[in-house]
């Protein structure tokens, strides 16, 4: 009821709490002398379900049978309507529609740690839509019983606040949960367990790792556990991995030797505990320990390549390049690279430590047989040296790979293909494919890239340090013993028409013809490999089509003669450049008038 109503009453039969689907009878009745003045039969009683009129009747009382009420609370309000006045509220009542509790399912209890308290969880089943009280009961040996009630509406957890002790680990305890509301009650099936069944150890703590003699092969993991722990699970993984290595150990007593860790690797370690081989549950995983394993001396050998450049009649420049060892080969922080250069006949040797670079350039005499050895060193030692005899890589013409081609292969990849050399192809021990950005000045500072290919391969996909719209000079070397042959080609992964034409910087007259000189197009405007230059000319003030001369592109060329101009005629000249994608816009225009006599 709303509370004591002065004007009348609303009663609900059989009860104001009903089972879903039940029917109720609602009666609204006026108290004496509370109706409309003058005529009691003018009393009009109206029954509202919340704000919706569901029934009315003239007189002192109204009966209404109501069905189909939804789960939850429905408010009924009775009002009185008299002639020439507003409706006035007489009284009201709520009807609560719900269901009896279902049997709680999957009751399970746990004690976290040997010093923890027993707590149980269960599944309530469907909502009752009514206040439902849960009572948890635990009975143990010697007729001991404990009981706890839950006042929360969505109760599915209770902590008894009692601690089971290991004095008699095999003693049986039985738990049961009972749900009660206004429409009924239901109890779970009993759950029977022992101390060993329900105690879940606390996760191990104070985890440490020690490496004897700073060696990864002599590693021990230490931790602390609760006193009764019998089993441990260890899991560990490199910090950048998602897969765990798992180890199960019995009676470890807080230590375990790990034998398969990789050097110079950050690992994550976690440990879990259990009290009994087949009873109870594993603890949560411990907090992670992160630790880096010690370095070991590098394994593997450096991939070394070189370039020779003629300086003068007696000297040559040698540039050595090498690739970083992989993390698994370096097995530590590489502190320096050791380069040894030796003249093989005279025995002279020089050694140098290189830090912070993976290249080294020196000048040596053109005479003699030279060899280099390069190794990588970390705090524990050095890798095996890679030895290379310095030779003329392109000297053996018969070893030159044939029909070299370079084609774009998707985004930022170039597929290089070739045919084996004419000389016995079985003599080839390996191919090396080398590429570097094409710079018209032949800049030796441009980074060099290379990859090695087996002797039976006739193609290689190059993708490292390949940028769109850049032209690369690509060489394929065939190596056989102390001989080498090479072929070269230009290639790009993506191209479009150059952004500008060459800039004519001079036109000079020579014996009745002219020599045109130009500046190279800046590399960033070439937009790929140039194939041709075109020189255009036409008579000034003429509307005729210009004549043109097409010159194959050569890296170093920046002048060209034209001998088809008429003397004493003023011409306008300009140039364009072409890639496979098309022709650039005009470069600058220059006027020129040939002074010489006509041929």
């Amino acid at each position: 009821k709303i509370d004591a109503c002065k004007r009348g009453d609303v009663t609900v039969k059989p009860s104001h709490v009903i089972l879903l689907g039940s029917t109720v009878n609602i009666t609204c009745s006026l108290k004496p002398r509370q109706g409309c003045f003058h005529y009691s039969r003018r009393n009009k009683l109206i029954l509202y379900k919340f704000d919706r009129r569901i029934n009315f009747h003239h007189g002192h009382s109204l009966n209404s049978q109501v069905t189909g009420l939804p789960l939850g609370t429905t408010l009924f309000v009775c009002k009185l309507a008299c002639i020439n006045s507003d409706e006035i509220q007489i009284c009201g009542a709520e009807i609560f529609v719900g269901v009896a509790p279902e049997q709680p399912q999957n009751l399970s209890c746990i004690q976290k740690g040997e010093q923890g308290t027993v707590a149980c969880t269960w599944e309530r089943g469907r909502d009752t839509h009514l206040y439902t009280e849960y009572t948890l009961q635990l009975s143990g040996p010697k007729n001991l019983t404990w009981q706890k009630q839950c006042k929360d509406i969505y109760c599915d957890y209770l902590d008894f606040g009692i601690n089971l002790t290991p004095e008699s680990p095999e003693s049986n305890f039985t738990a049961k949960v009972t749900a009660v509301n206004s429409l009924g009650s239901s109890s779970s099936l009993p759950s029977t367990f022992t101390f060993l069944d329900i105690v879940r150890p606390l996760p191990p703590w104070d985890i440490r790792i020690k490496f004897q003699k700073a060696s990864v092969s002599r590693c021990t993991l230490y931790w602390r556990d609760e006193g009764l722990v019998l089993l441990n699970r260890l899991r560990y993984r490199p910090s950048n991995s998602r897969l765990w290595n798992m180890v199960n150990v019995t009676k470890a007593k807080g230590r375990h030797d790990l034998l398969d860790l990789k050097p110079f690797t950050e690992y994550e370690f976690q440990i879990s505990s259990k009290l009994h081989l087949y009873k109870g549950s594993w603890s949560d995983w411990s907090e992670s320990l992160r630790a880096q394993t010690p370095e070991e001396e590098p394994t593997g050998m450096l991939d070394v390549w070189y370039m020779k450049r003629h300086i003068d009649y007696s000297r040559q420049q040698i540039s050595l390049f090498w690739k970083n060892l992989s993390v698994s080969e370096a097995r530590g922080k590489i502190l320096h690279y050791q380069v040894t250069l030796q003249e093989l006949t005279g025995g002279k040797a020089m050694t140098q430590n290189i830090t912070g670079h993976t290249s080294w350039t020196t000048v040596i005499p053109r005479t003699g047989n030279w060899a280099v050895a390069v190794s990588a060193a970390n705090s524990k030692g050095s890798s095996l040296p890679t030895r290379i005899n310095i030779m003329n890589l392109c000297e053996a013409g018969l070893l030159a790979p044939r029909q070299v081609s370079a084609n774009s292969e998707g985004m930022d990849n170039i597929l290089v293909t070739w045919q084996p050399p004419r000389k016995d192809p079985s003599a080839v021990q390996e191919y090396v494919v080398e590429w570097r950005e094409l710079h018209p000045g032949g800049d030796t500072q441009v980074p060099l890239n290379w990859l090695r290919s087996r002797p039976y391969n006739v193609s290689a996909l190059i993708s490292e340090n390949i940028k769109s719209y850049i032209c690369y000079e690509i060489r394929v070397y065939a190596l056989s013993g102390d001989q080498g042959g090479c072929s070269s080609i230009l290639g790009n992964s993506k191209h479009k028409a150059p952004l500008s034409g060459p800039h004519i910087n001079a036109i000079t007259e020579e014996k009745g013809s002219i020599l045109i000189s130009w500046n190279s197009i800046p590399v960033q405007e070439q937009m790929g490999c140039l194939l041709h230059y075109r020189i255009y000319w036409k008579e000034r003030d003429s509307n005729s089509q210009p004549q043109l001369c097409e010159i194959p592109y050569r890296v170093s060329q920046n002048s060209h003669p034209i001998n088809s101009l008429q003397p004493r005629v003023t011409y306008v000249l300009w140039m364009t450049a072409l890639t496979a994608a098309g022709e650039s816009s005009h470069g600058n225009e220059r006027e020129f008038c040939l002074q010489g006599k006509a041929n």
Partner: nanobody, 115 residues
Framework: QVQLQESGGGLVQPGGSLRLSCTAS????????MDWYRQAPGNEREWVAS???????YYDGSAKGRFTISRDNAKMTVYLQMNSLEPEDTAVYFC?????????WGQGTQVTVSS
């Protein structure tokens, strides 16, 4: 045990607005309706608006179109936004939570509409 505390009442001019709040202690309120009632001097307490546990609002005829009831189950609070107030709305406004074990009422907050 559920306790209810109303707030937000005051003096307002005709045509003005007020927002009443009622905060409950005890999480059981989330499965029940929350209601607003009012009692004018010399009159009986009358129902104004209800909101179900799932958020469906209902209004008495005098409140329909001017008042809006809402609830925030996380904060265990029900609100009544009252617009276009008239002198006839002057009353003490009470918050109520009906349960099958009995009704819980707040102490009320005074709303006075006067120029």
């Amino acid at each position: 045990q559920v306790q209810l505390q109303e707030s937000g009442g005051g003096l307002v001019q005709p045509g003005g607005s007020l927002r009443l709040s009622c905060t409950a202690s005890g999480s059981i309120v989330s499965i029940y309706n929350m209601d607003w009632y009012r009692q004018a001097p010399g009159n009986e307490r009358e129902w104004v608006a209800s909101i179900t546990s799932s958020g469906d609002p209902y209004y008495d005829g005098s409140a329909k179109g001017r008042f809006t009831i809402s609830r925030d189950n996380a904060k265990m609070t029900v609100y009544l936004q009252m617009n276009s107030l008239e002198p006839e709305d002057t009353a003490v406004y009470f918050c109520k939570v009906p349960t099958e074990k009995g009704n819980y009422w707040g102490q009320g907050t005074q709303v006075t509409v006067s120029s």
